[in-house]
Interface confidence: low
Amino acid sequence: TQNKALPENVKYGIVLDAGSSHTSLYIYKWPAEKENDTGVVHQVEECRVKGPGISKFVQKVNEIGIYLTDCMERAREVIPRSQHQETPVYLGATAGMRLLRMESEELADRVLDVVERSLSNYPFDFQGARIITGQEEGAYGWITINYLLGKFSQKTRWFSIVPYETNNQETFGALDLGGASTQVTFVPQNQTIESPDNALQFRLYGKDYNVYTHSFLCYGKDQALWQKLAKDIQVASNEILRDPCFHPGYKKVVNVSDLYKTPCTKRFEMTLPFQQFEIQGIGNYQQCHQSILELFNTSYCPYSQCAFNGIFLPPLQGDFGAFSAFYFVMKFLNLTSEKVSQEKVTEMMKKFCAQPWEEIKTSYAGVKEKYLSEYCFSGTYILSLLLQGYHFTADSWEHIHFIGKIQGSDAGWTLGYMLNLTNMIPAEQPLSTPLSHSTYV
Protein backbone atom coordinates (compact mmCIF):
# COMPACT_ATOMS: atom_id res chain seq x y z
CA THR A 1 0.00 0.00 0.00
CA GLN A 2 1.06 3.53 -0.74
CA ASN A 3 2.27 5.65 2.17
CA LYS A 4 0.02 8.67 2.56
CA ALA A 5 1.82 11.86 3.55
CA LEU A 6 0.51 13.24 6.81
CA PRO A 7 -1.05 16.70 6.45
CA GLU A 8 1.47 19.41 7.23
CA ASN A 9 0.80 21.00 10.60
CA VAL A 10 1.56 24.54 9.52
CA LYS A 11 0.18 28.00 10.04
CA TYR A 12 0.08 31.03 7.76
CA GLY A 13 -0.04 34.79 8.23
CA ILE A 14 -0.51 37.69 5.80
CA VAL A 15 0.88 41.21 6.16
CA LEU A 16 0.23 44.03 3.70
CA ASP A 17 2.86 46.76 3.64
CA ALA A 18 1.02 49.86 2.44
CA GLY A 19 3.98 52.06 1.56
CA SER A 20 4.05 55.52 0.02
CA SER A 21 4.82 54.33 -3.50
CA HIS A 22 3.18 50.90 -3.59
CA THR A 23 1.60 48.13 -1.53
CA SER A 24 3.09 44.66 -1.13
CA LEU A 25 1.46 41.57 0.34
CA TYR A 26 3.62 39.03 2.17
CA ILE A 27 2.58 35.50 3.09
CA TYR A 28 4.42 33.80 5.96
CA LYS A 29 4.39 30.16 6.99
CA TRP A 30 5.64 28.28 10.05
CA PRO A 31 5.37 24.85 11.71
CA ALA A 32 2.52 25.03 14.22
CA GLU A 33 4.35 23.14 16.97
CA LYS A 34 7.41 25.38 16.80
CA GLU A 35 5.74 28.79 17.10
CA ASN A 36 7.95 30.00 19.92
CA ASP A 37 11.23 29.02 18.29
CA THR A 38 13.39 31.62 16.68
CA GLY A 39 13.93 31.45 12.94
CA VAL A 40 11.09 29.11 11.98
CA VAL A 41 8.82 31.62 10.24
CA HIS A 42 9.61 32.16 6.59
CA GLN A 43 8.12 34.03 3.67
CA VAL A 44 6.45 31.92 1.00
CA GLU A 45 5.14 34.64 -1.28
CA GLU A 46 5.38 38.33 -2.07
CA CYS A 47 2.75 39.96 -4.26
CA ARG A 48 3.24 43.53 -5.38
CA VAL A 49 -0.05 45.32 -5.84
CA LYS A 50 -0.27 47.08 -9.22
CA GLY A 51 -0.53 50.84 -8.88
CA PRO A 52 0.58 53.54 -6.44
CA GLY A 53 0.38 53.64 -2.65
CA ILE A 54 -3.02 53.72 -0.90
CA SER A 55 -2.65 57.41 -0.01
CA LYS A 56 -3.04 58.20 -3.73
CA PHE A 57 -6.62 56.81 -3.65
CA VAL A 58 -7.88 59.63 -1.49
CA GLN A 59 -10.10 61.02 -4.28
CA LYS A 60 -11.12 57.58 -5.60
CA VAL A 61 -11.60 55.34 -2.58
CA ASN A 62 -14.17 53.28 -4.52
CA GLU A 63 -11.26 51.82 -6.52
CA ILE A 64 -9.39 50.44 -3.50
CA GLY A 65 -11.26 47.12 -3.61
CA ILE A 66 -10.26 46.41 -7.21
CA TYR A 67 -6.70 47.56 -6.47
CA LEU A 68 -6.28 44.91 -3.74
CA THR A 69 -8.07 42.09 -5.57
CA ASP A 70 -5.20 40.45 -7.50
CA CYS A 71 -2.92 40.00 -4.50
CA MET A 72 -5.68 38.92 -2.15
CA GLU A 73 -6.81 36.35 -4.72
CA ARG A 74 -3.20 35.18 -4.95
CA ALA A 75 -3.24 34.65 -1.16
CA ARG A 76 -6.40 32.56 -1.56
CA GLU A 77 -4.54 30.33 -4.04
CA VAL A 78 -1.32 29.98 -2.01
CA ILE A 79 -2.89 29.24 1.38
CA PRO A 80 -4.83 25.95 1.60
CA ARG A 81 -8.58 26.57 1.87
CA SER A 82 -8.77 24.66 5.16
CA GLN A 83 -6.43 27.29 6.67
CA HIS A 84 -8.18 30.43 5.39
CA GLN A 85 -10.33 31.17 8.42
CA GLU A 86 -7.46 30.93 10.88
CA THR A 87 -4.96 32.93 8.81
CA PRO A 88 -4.54 36.41 10.27
CA VAL A 89 -4.33 39.39 7.88
CA TYR A 90 -2.75 42.65 9.00
CA LEU A 91 -2.28 45.84 7.00
CA GLY A 92 0.23 48.41 8.17
CA ALA A 93 0.49 51.75 6.42
CA THR A 94 3.67 53.78 6.69
CA ALA A 95 4.88 57.28 5.88
CA GLY A 96 2.70 57.96 2.82
CA MET A 97 -0.35 57.67 5.05
CA ARG A 98 1.37 59.53 7.90
CA LEU A 99 1.74 62.44 5.50
CA LEU A 100 -1.88 62.19 4.38
CA ARG A 101 -3.00 62.15 8.02
CA MET A 102 -0.97 65.34 8.62
CA GLU A 103 -2.95 66.99 5.84
CA SER A 104 -6.31 65.55 6.84
CA GLU A 105 -7.12 63.00 9.52
CA GLU A 106 -10.57 62.62 7.99
CA LEU A 107 -9.21 61.69 4.55
CA ALA A 108 -6.71 59.22 6.02
CA ASP A 109 -9.49 57.59 8.05
CA ARG A 110 -11.67 57.35 4.97
CA VAL A 111 -8.94 55.53 3.01
CA LEU A 112 -8.29 53.12 5.91
CA ASP A 113 -12.00 52.54 6.37
CA VAL A 114 -12.42 51.45 2.74
CA VAL A 115 -9.26 49.31 2.97
CA GLU A 116 -10.71 47.57 6.04
CA ARG A 117 -14.06 46.97 4.37
CA SER A 118 -12.34 45.56 1.27
CA LEU A 119 -10.09 43.22 3.25
CA SER A 120 -12.99 42.03 5.42
CA ASN A 121 -14.61 40.53 2.31
CA TYR A 122 -12.00 37.76 2.14
CA PRO A 123 -12.27 34.44 4.00
CA PHE A 124 -9.24 35.18 6.19
CA ASP A 125 -9.11 36.35 9.81
CA PHE A 126 -8.76 40.09 9.16
CA GLN A 127 -7.13 41.81 12.13
CA GLY A 128 -7.29 45.44 11.03
CA ALA A 129 -5.56 48.15 9.04
CA ARG A 130 -3.67 50.93 10.77
CA ILE A 131 -0.98 53.52 10.25
CA ILE A 132 2.06 52.27 12.15
CA THR A 133 4.34 54.81 13.80
CA GLY A 134 7.84 55.53 12.54
CA GLN A 135 9.13 54.07 15.81
CA GLU A 136 7.26 50.80 15.17
CA GLU A 137 8.52 50.69 11.59
CA GLY A 138 12.11 50.97 12.82
CA ALA A 139 11.62 48.49 15.66
CA TYR A 140 9.91 45.82 13.56
CA GLY A 141 12.56 46.11 10.85
CA TRP A 142 15.22 45.55 13.51
CA ILE A 143 13.33 42.53 14.89
CA THR A 144 12.90 41.07 11.38
CA ILE A 145 16.53 41.08 10.40
CA ASN A 146 17.81 39.85 13.75
CA TYR A 147 15.18 37.10 13.87
CA LEU A 148 16.17 35.95 10.37
CA LEU A 149 19.87 36.16 11.20
CA GLY A 150 19.32 33.96 14.26
CA LYS A 151 20.54 36.64 16.67
CA PHE A 152 17.86 35.88 19.24
CA SER A 153 18.59 32.16 19.52
CA GLN A 154 20.61 31.10 22.55
CA LYS A 155 22.44 28.45 20.58
CA THR A 156 25.61 29.70 18.96
CA ARG A 157 25.95 28.01 15.61
CA TRP A 158 29.30 26.75 14.42
CA PHE A 159 28.30 27.55 10.85
CA SER A 160 27.11 30.64 9.08
CA ILE A 161 23.80 30.70 7.18
CA VAL A 162 24.37 33.98 5.39
CA PRO A 163 27.63 35.49 4.11
CA TYR A 164 27.61 38.48 6.47
CA GLU A 165 26.52 36.61 9.57
CA THR A 166 28.93 36.68 12.46
CA ASN A 167 28.69 33.85 14.95
CA ASN A 168 28.32 36.12 17.94
CA GLN A 169 24.98 37.18 19.35
CA GLU A 170 25.60 40.89 18.72
CA THR A 171 22.51 42.19 16.97
CA PHE A 172 22.63 43.97 13.63
CA GLY A 173 21.45 47.55 13.33
CA ALA A 174 18.68 48.19 10.79
CA LEU A 175 18.71 50.87 8.10
CA ASP A 176 15.44 51.14 6.18
CA LEU A 177 14.81 53.53 3.30
CA GLY A 178 11.32 53.98 1.92
CA GLY A 179 9.74 56.48 -0.43
CA ALA A 180 8.60 58.90 2.27
CA SER A 181 10.65 58.09 5.39
CA THR A 182 13.86 56.44 6.51
CA GLN A 183 14.56 54.60 9.77
CA VAL A 184 17.76 53.94 11.73
CA THR A 185 17.61 51.40 14.60
CA PHE A 186 20.41 49.77 16.61
CA VAL A 187 21.65 48.83 20.07
CA PRO A 188 24.17 51.50 21.12
CA GLN A 189 27.23 50.47 23.12
CA ASN A 190 26.77 51.35 26.83
CA GLN A 191 25.34 54.70 25.80
CA THR A 192 22.37 56.34 27.43
CA ILE A 193 19.71 57.20 24.91
CA GLU A 194 19.43 60.90 25.64
CA SER A 195 16.03 61.40 24.06
CA PRO A 196 13.17 59.24 25.44
CA ASP A 197 11.31 59.31 22.10
CA ASN A 198 14.16 57.37 20.54
CA ALA A 199 14.44 54.68 23.23
CA LEU A 200 12.89 51.21 23.10
CA GLN A 201 13.21 48.41 25.65
CA PHE A 202 12.61 44.82 24.61
CA ARG A 203 12.87 41.52 26.42
CA LEU A 204 13.15 38.80 23.79
CA TYR A 205 13.94 35.13 24.42
CA GLY A 206 15.14 35.93 27.93
CA LYS A 207 17.43 38.81 27.01
CA ASP A 208 17.01 42.58 27.48
CA TYR A 209 17.71 44.98 24.63
CA ASN A 210 17.95 48.77 24.85
CA VAL A 211 17.38 49.95 21.33
CA TYR A 212 17.75 53.36 19.69
CA THR A 213 15.39 54.16 16.81
CA HIS A 214 14.36 57.19 14.79
CA SER A 215 12.21 57.61 11.70
CA PHE A 216 12.87 60.69 9.58
CA LEU A 217 9.58 61.63 7.93
CA CYS A 218 10.05 63.31 4.51
CA TYR A 219 13.52 61.79 4.13
CA GLY A 220 12.51 58.74 2.12
CA LYS A 221 14.04 58.94 -1.33
CA ASP A 222 10.92 60.18 -3.15
CA GLN A 223 10.03 62.88 -0.66
CA ALA A 224 13.70 63.89 -0.40
CA LEU A 225 13.66 64.45 -4.16
CA TRP A 226 10.55 66.62 -3.88
CA GLN A 227 12.25 68.58 -1.09
CA LYS A 228 15.37 69.08 -3.18
CA LEU A 229 13.37 70.26 -6.21
CA ALA A 230 11.32 72.66 -4.08
CA LYS A 231 14.48 74.04 -2.51
CA ASP A 232 16.30 74.44 -5.82
CA ILE A 233 13.43 76.00 -7.79
CA GLN A 234 13.38 78.84 -5.23
CA VAL A 235 16.61 80.19 -6.70
CA ALA A 236 16.02 79.32 -10.37
CA SER A 237 15.89 82.42 -12.54
CA ASN A 238 13.21 81.01 -14.87
CA GLU A 239 11.21 77.87 -15.53
CA ILE A 240 14.30 75.85 -16.36
CA LEU A 241 15.93 73.97 -13.48
CA ARG A 242 19.41 72.78 -14.34
CA ASP A 243 19.71 69.80 -12.05
CA PRO A 244 22.98 67.96 -11.28
CA CYS A 245 21.08 64.93 -9.93
CA PHE A 246 19.76 63.95 -13.37
CA HIS A 247 21.73 62.72 -16.37
CA PRO A 248 22.96 65.18 -19.01
CA GLY A 249 20.29 65.52 -21.71
CA TYR A 250 17.46 64.40 -19.44
CA LYS A 251 14.38 66.64 -19.50
CA LYS A 252 11.18 66.48 -17.49
CA VAL A 253 8.31 68.88 -16.93
CA VAL A 254 7.11 69.28 -13.35
CA ASN A 255 3.84 70.87 -12.27
CA VAL A 256 4.39 73.35 -9.45
CA SER A 257 1.07 72.18 -7.96
CA ASP A 258 2.49 68.63 -7.72
CA LEU A 259 5.63 69.96 -6.11
CA TYR A 260 3.71 71.69 -3.33
CA LYS A 261 1.17 68.88 -2.89
CA THR A 262 3.19 67.18 -0.19
CA PRO A 263 3.65 68.52 3.37
CA CYS A 264 7.36 67.73 2.92
CA THR A 265 7.89 70.76 0.67
CA LYS A 266 5.93 73.27 2.79
CA ARG A 267 9.09 74.81 4.25
CA PHE A 268 10.30 75.70 0.74
CA GLU A 269 6.97 76.88 -0.67
CA MET A 270 6.87 80.25 -2.41
CA THR A 271 4.83 81.95 -5.10
CA LEU A 272 6.50 81.22 -8.43
CA PRO A 273 5.86 83.17 -11.64
CA PHE A 274 5.13 79.94 -13.55
CA GLN A 275 2.88 76.88 -13.17
CA GLN A 276 5.38 74.39 -14.57
CA PHE A 277 9.10 74.10 -14.92
CA GLU A 278 11.41 71.81 -16.82
CA ILE A 279 14.19 69.85 -15.15
CA GLN A 280 17.24 69.70 -17.40
CA GLY A 281 19.82 67.21 -16.21
CA ILE A 282 23.49 68.19 -16.06
CA GLY A 283 24.72 65.02 -14.31
CA ASN A 284 27.25 66.12 -11.72
CA TYR A 285 27.60 63.94 -8.60
CA GLN A 286 29.51 66.49 -6.53
CA GLN A 287 27.00 69.28 -7.13
CA CYS A 288 24.11 66.87 -6.55
CA HIS A 289 25.67 65.78 -3.25
CA GLN A 290 26.07 69.43 -2.19
CA SER A 291 22.46 70.19 -3.05
CA ILE A 292 21.25 67.19 -1.01
CA LEU A 293 23.31 68.22 2.01
CA GLU A 294 21.29 71.44 2.19
CA LEU A 295 18.29 69.30 3.20
CA PHE A 296 20.07 68.26 6.41
CA ASN A 297 20.17 70.94 9.10
CA THR A 298 23.31 70.20 11.08
CA SER A 299 23.68 73.67 12.60
CA TYR A 300 21.97 72.89 15.89
CA CYS A 301 22.00 69.90 18.24
CA PRO A 302 20.56 69.92 21.78
CA TYR A 303 22.28 66.59 22.59
CA SER A 304 25.83 65.25 22.83
CA GLN A 305 25.54 64.14 19.19
CA CYS A 306 22.91 64.43 16.46
CA ALA A 307 22.09 62.99 13.08
CA PHE A 308 20.48 66.10 11.53
CA ASN A 309 17.54 68.41 12.20
CA GLY A 310 18.37 68.30 15.94
CA ILE A 311 17.65 64.57 16.28
CA PHE A 312 19.75 62.63 18.79
CA LEU A 313 21.93 59.84 17.35
CA PRO A 314 24.28 57.79 19.55
CA PRO A 315 27.69 56.70 18.19
CA LEU A 316 27.21 53.93 15.62
CA GLN A 317 27.84 50.44 16.89
CA GLY A 318 28.33 47.09 15.15
CA ASP A 319 27.10 45.83 11.81
CA PHE A 320 24.06 47.19 9.98
CA GLY A 321 21.66 45.66 7.52
CA ALA A 322 20.51 48.24 4.95
CA PHE A 323 17.33 47.14 3.20
CA SER A 324 14.28 48.22 1.20
CA ALA A 325 15.31 51.08 -1.13
CA PHE A 326 18.86 51.10 0.27
CA TYR A 327 19.13 47.64 -1.25
CA PHE A 328 17.05 48.12 -4.43
CA VAL A 329 18.96 51.22 -5.50
CA MET A 330 22.43 49.88 -4.66
CA LYS A 331 21.56 46.56 -6.33
CA PHE A 332 20.57 48.35 -9.52
CA LEU A 333 23.85 50.30 -9.41
CA ASN A 334 25.72 47.02 -8.76
CA LEU A 335 27.16 48.40 -5.52
CA THR A 336 25.96 45.87 -2.94
CA SER A 337 29.13 43.79 -2.82
CA GLU A 338 30.89 43.61 0.55
CA LYS A 339 34.15 44.28 -1.26
CA VAL A 340 33.18 47.71 -2.64
CA SER A 341 34.65 50.46 -0.48
CA GLN A 342 32.88 53.76 0.13
CA GLU A 343 35.47 55.55 -2.03
CA LYS A 344 34.76 53.11 -4.86
CA VAL A 345 30.99 53.64 -4.48
CA THR A 346 31.49 57.41 -4.73
CA GLU A 347 33.70 56.96 -7.80
CA MET A 348 31.10 54.76 -9.49
CA MET A 349 28.34 57.26 -8.71
CA LYS A 350 30.37 60.10 -10.27
CA LYS A 351 30.71 58.07 -13.47
CA PHE A 352 27.08 56.93 -13.48
CA CYS A 353 25.58 60.40 -13.01
CA ALA A 354 27.81 61.85 -15.73
CA GLN A 355 26.58 59.36 -18.35
CA PRO A 356 24.31 60.98 -20.97
CA TRP A 357 20.62 60.17 -20.66
CA GLU A 358 20.43 58.72 -24.19
CA GLU A 359 23.28 56.34 -23.33
CA ILE A 360 21.62 55.34 -20.04
CA LYS A 361 18.31 54.64 -21.83
CA THR A 362 20.10 52.39 -24.31
CA SER A 363 22.07 50.55 -21.63
CA TYR A 364 18.97 49.88 -19.51
CA ALA A 365 16.36 49.52 -22.24
CA GLY A 366 14.03 47.34 -20.16
CA VAL A 367 13.79 49.70 -17.18
CA LYS A 368 10.90 52.13 -16.81
CA GLU A 369 12.19 55.62 -17.48
CA LYS A 370 10.49 57.00 -14.40
CA TYR A 371 12.65 54.75 -12.24
CA LEU A 372 15.73 54.86 -14.42
CA SER A 373 15.93 58.64 -14.39
CA GLU A 374 16.13 58.75 -10.59
CA TYR A 375 18.94 56.32 -9.81
CA CYS A 376 21.57 59.07 -9.98
CA PHE A 377 19.65 61.10 -7.40
CA SER A 378 18.79 58.05 -5.26
CA GLY A 379 22.35 56.69 -5.20
CA THR A 380 23.76 60.10 -4.32
CA TYR A 381 21.07 60.56 -1.67
CA ILE A 382 21.92 57.21 -0.06
CA LEU A 383 25.59 58.19 0.18
CA SER A 384 24.74 61.62 1.59
CA LEU A 385 22.29 60.18 4.13
CA LEU A 386 24.63 57.46 5.35
CA LEU A 387 27.79 59.56 5.45
CA GLN A 388 26.65 63.03 6.45
CA GLY A 389 23.24 62.17 7.93
CA TYR A 390 24.13 59.11 10.03
CA HIS A 391 27.91 59.71 10.27
CA PHE A 392 29.18 56.51 8.71
CA THR A 393 32.79 56.91 7.56
CA ALA A 394 34.95 55.31 4.89
CA ASP A 395 36.08 52.86 7.60
CA SER A 396 32.68 52.04 9.09
CA TRP A 397 31.17 51.68 5.57
CA GLU A 398 32.31 48.04 5.58
CA HIS A 399 29.90 47.42 8.47
CA ILE A 400 26.94 48.22 6.19
CA HIS A 401 25.49 45.11 4.50
CA PHE A 402 23.00 45.81 1.71
CA ILE A 403 20.39 43.10 2.20
CA GLY A 404 17.43 42.17 0.02
CA LYS A 405 16.41 38.84 1.51
CA ILE A 406 17.66 36.70 4.38
CA GLN A 407 16.94 32.98 4.04
CA GLY A 408 14.36 33.75 1.35
CA SER A 409 12.42 36.28 3.44
CA ASP A 410 12.43 39.98 2.57
CA ALA A 411 14.19 42.27 5.01
CA GLY A 412 11.64 44.85 6.18
CA TRP A 413 9.23 45.59 8.99
CA THR A 414 6.40 43.21 8.01
CA LEU A 415 7.76 39.96 9.47
CA GLY A 416 8.60 41.63 12.81
CA TYR A 417 5.13 43.15 12.86
CA MET A 418 3.46 39.78 12.39
CA LEU A 419 5.73 38.03 14.91
CA ASN A 420 4.76 40.63 17.48
CA LEU A 421 1.01 40.61 16.79
CA THR A 422 0.82 36.81 16.81
CA ASN A 423 2.86 36.68 20.06
CA MET A 424 5.53 34.57 18.41
CA ILE A 425 8.47 36.24 20.10
CA PRO A 426 8.39 35.18 23.73
CA ALA A 427 9.91 37.43 26.39
CA GLU A 428 11.50 34.39 28.02
CA GLN A 429 13.48 31.57 26.49
CA PRO A 430 11.04 28.64 25.88
CA LEU A 431 11.60 25.85 28.43
CA SER A 432 11.42 22.86 26.10
CA THR A 433 14.09 23.04 23.45
CA PRO A 434 13.32 21.28 20.18
CA LEU A 435 15.58 18.43 19.13
CA SER A 436 17.54 20.33 16.58
CA HIS A 437 17.43 23.71 14.91
CA SER A 438 19.33 22.39 11.94
CA THR A 439 16.22 20.65 10.62
CA TYR A 440 14.45 23.89 9.81
CA VAL A 441 17.10 26.59 9.69
Epitope: E63, E278, E369, E374
Partner: nanobody, 135 residues
Framework: QLQLVESGGGLVQPGGSLRLSCAAS????????IAWFRQRPGKEREGVSC????????NYADSVKGRFTASRDNAKNTVYLQMNSLKPEDTAVYYC????????????????????????????WGQGTQVTVSS
Protein backbone atom coordinates in the same frame (compact mmCIF):
# COMPACT_ATOMS: atom_id res chain seq x y z
CA GLN B 1 4.30 77.83 -23.25
CA LEU B 2 3.72 74.09 -22.80
CA GLN B 3 0.81 72.72 -24.78
CA LEU B 4 -0.72 69.73 -26.54
CA VAL B 5 -2.82 70.48 -29.62
CA GLU B 6 -5.05 67.84 -31.22
CA SER B 7 -6.24 68.09 -34.82
CA GLY B 8 -7.73 65.89 -37.53
CA GLY B 9 -11.23 65.41 -36.13
CA GLY B 10 -14.36 65.82 -38.22
CA LEU B 11 -17.46 64.16 -39.63
CA VAL B 12 -17.02 60.75 -41.27
CA GLN B 13 -19.34 57.99 -42.48
CA PRO B 14 -19.46 54.59 -40.77
CA GLY B 15 -16.64 52.39 -42.09
CA GLY B 16 -14.55 55.48 -42.91
CA SER B 17 -11.13 56.53 -41.55
CA LEU B 18 -9.59 59.52 -39.80
CA ARG B 19 -6.10 60.33 -38.61
CA LEU B 20 -5.79 62.42 -35.45
CA SER B 21 -2.59 64.28 -34.59
CA CYS B 22 -1.37 65.59 -31.28
CA ALA B 23 1.49 68.09 -31.44
CA ALA B 24 3.44 69.08 -28.35
CA SER B 25 5.17 72.37 -27.85
CA UNK B 26 7.34 73.50 -24.96
CA UNK B 27 8.49 69.97 -24.07
CA UNK B 28 9.75 66.84 -25.80
CA UNK B 29 7.11 64.12 -26.15
CA UNK B 30 9.50 61.19 -26.31
CA UNK B 31 10.29 61.38 -22.59
CA UNK B 32 6.70 60.89 -21.51
CA UNK B 33 3.94 58.32 -21.55
CA ILE B 34 1.26 59.56 -23.94
CA ALA B 35 -2.34 58.38 -24.23
CA TRP B 36 -5.37 58.97 -26.39
CA PHE B 37 -8.63 59.26 -24.46
CA ARG B 38 -12.16 59.87 -25.63
CA GLN B 39 -15.33 61.13 -24.03
CA ARG B 40 -18.53 59.86 -25.58
CA PRO B 41 -21.75 61.82 -25.05
CA GLY B 42 -22.97 61.30 -21.48
CA LYS B 43 -20.12 58.93 -20.65
CA GLU B 44 -16.91 59.10 -18.60
CA ARG B 45 -13.62 59.85 -20.33
CA GLU B 46 -11.98 56.51 -21.22
CA GLY B 47 -8.57 55.37 -22.39
CA VAL B 48 -8.31 54.43 -26.06
CA SER B 49 -4.61 53.91 -26.57
CA CYS B 50 -1.62 54.25 -24.26
CA UNK B 51 2.00 54.55 -25.39
CA UNK B 52 4.58 53.70 -22.74
CA UNK B 53 7.52 56.06 -22.32
CA UNK B 54 10.13 53.43 -21.48
CA UNK B 55 9.83 50.90 -24.28
CA UNK B 56 7.30 52.33 -26.70
CA UNK B 57 4.79 49.56 -25.94
CA UNK B 58 1.31 50.48 -27.14
CA ASN B 59 -1.87 49.23 -25.49
CA TYR B 60 -5.40 49.55 -26.83
CA ALA B 61 -8.84 49.41 -25.26
CA ASP B 62 -10.70 46.25 -26.30
CA SER B 63 -13.34 48.28 -28.14
CA VAL B 64 -10.80 49.68 -30.65
CA LYS B 65 -8.30 46.81 -30.99
CA GLY B 66 -7.57 45.97 -34.62
CA ARG B 67 -9.18 49.20 -35.87
CA PHE B 68 -7.11 51.98 -34.26
CA THR B 69 -3.33 52.37 -34.45
CA ALA B 70 -1.32 54.81 -32.36
CA SER B 71 2.19 55.92 -33.26
CA ARG B 72 4.63 58.65 -32.41
CA ASP B 73 7.06 60.67 -34.51
CA ASN B 74 9.68 61.98 -32.12
CA ALA B 75 11.31 64.14 -34.79
CA LYS B 76 8.04 66.02 -35.29
CA ASN B 77 7.20 65.90 -31.55
CA THR B 78 3.79 64.52 -32.51
CA VAL B 79 1.69 61.44 -31.75
CA TYR B 80 -0.97 60.08 -34.10
CA LEU B 81 -4.10 57.97 -33.86
CA GLN B 82 -5.09 56.27 -37.10
CA MET B 83 -8.76 55.29 -36.85
CA ASN B 84 -10.16 52.81 -39.41
CA SER B 85 -13.54 51.04 -39.75
CA LEU B 86 -15.18 53.76 -37.70
CA LYS B 87 -18.53 53.06 -36.05
CA PRO B 88 -21.23 55.43 -34.76
CA GLU B 89 -20.24 54.47 -31.19
CA ASP B 90 -16.77 55.96 -31.84
CA THR B 91 -18.40 59.41 -31.86
CA ALA B 92 -16.69 61.37 -29.11
CA VAL B 93 -14.32 64.20 -28.23
CA TYR B 94 -10.81 62.72 -28.51
CA TYR B 95 -8.05 64.02 -26.23
CA CYS B 96 -4.38 63.34 -26.08
CA UNK B 97 -2.71 63.43 -22.67
CA UNK B 98 0.84 63.27 -21.36
CA UNK B 99 2.03 61.84 -18.07
CA UNK B 100 4.38 64.62 -16.99
CA UNK B 101 4.15 63.63 -13.37
CA UNK B 102 7.34 64.14 -11.40
CA UNK B 103 5.94 61.80 -8.75
CA UNK B 104 8.72 59.26 -8.38
CA UNK B 105 7.69 55.64 -8.66
CA UNK B 106 4.05 56.49 -9.25
CA UNK B 107 3.47 53.32 -11.21
CA UNK B 108 1.07 54.47 -13.92
CA UNK B 109 -1.37 51.86 -15.21
CA UNK B 110 -0.41 51.41 -18.82
CA UNK B 111 -3.02 48.86 -19.87
CA UNK B 112 -5.49 51.51 -21.01
CA UNK B 113 -8.07 50.18 -18.58
CA UNK B 114 -8.74 51.33 -15.06
CA UNK B 115 -11.13 54.24 -15.51
CA UNK B 116 -10.41 57.18 -13.28
CA UNK B 117 -7.27 55.53 -11.91
CA UNK B 118 -5.84 55.59 -15.42
CA UNK B 119 -7.02 59.16 -16.08
CA UNK B 120 -5.43 60.34 -12.86
CA UNK B 121 -1.96 59.30 -14.01
CA UNK B 122 -2.10 61.73 -16.95
CA UNK B 123 -1.74 65.28 -15.77
CA UNK B 124 -1.38 67.31 -18.95
CA TRP B 125 -4.20 67.41 -21.54
CA GLY B 126 -4.97 68.88 -24.92
CA GLN B 127 -8.23 70.72 -25.58
CA GLY B 128 -9.73 67.81 -27.57
CA THR B 129 -10.97 67.31 -31.12
CA GLN B 130 -14.53 66.22 -32.08
CA VAL B 131 -15.01 63.04 -34.10
CA THR B 132 -18.54 62.34 -35.38
CA VAL B 133 -19.37 59.07 -37.15
CA SER B 134 -22.73 59.30 -38.86
CA SER B 135 -24.38 58.56 -42.18
Amino acid sequence: QLQLVESGGGLVQPGGSLRLSCAASGFTLDYYAIAWFRQRPGKEREGVSCISSSNGNINYADSVKGRFTASRDNAKNTVYLQMNSLKPEDTAVYYCAADLSAAPYNDAVRSCTGGSRLRATYDFWGQGTQVTVSS
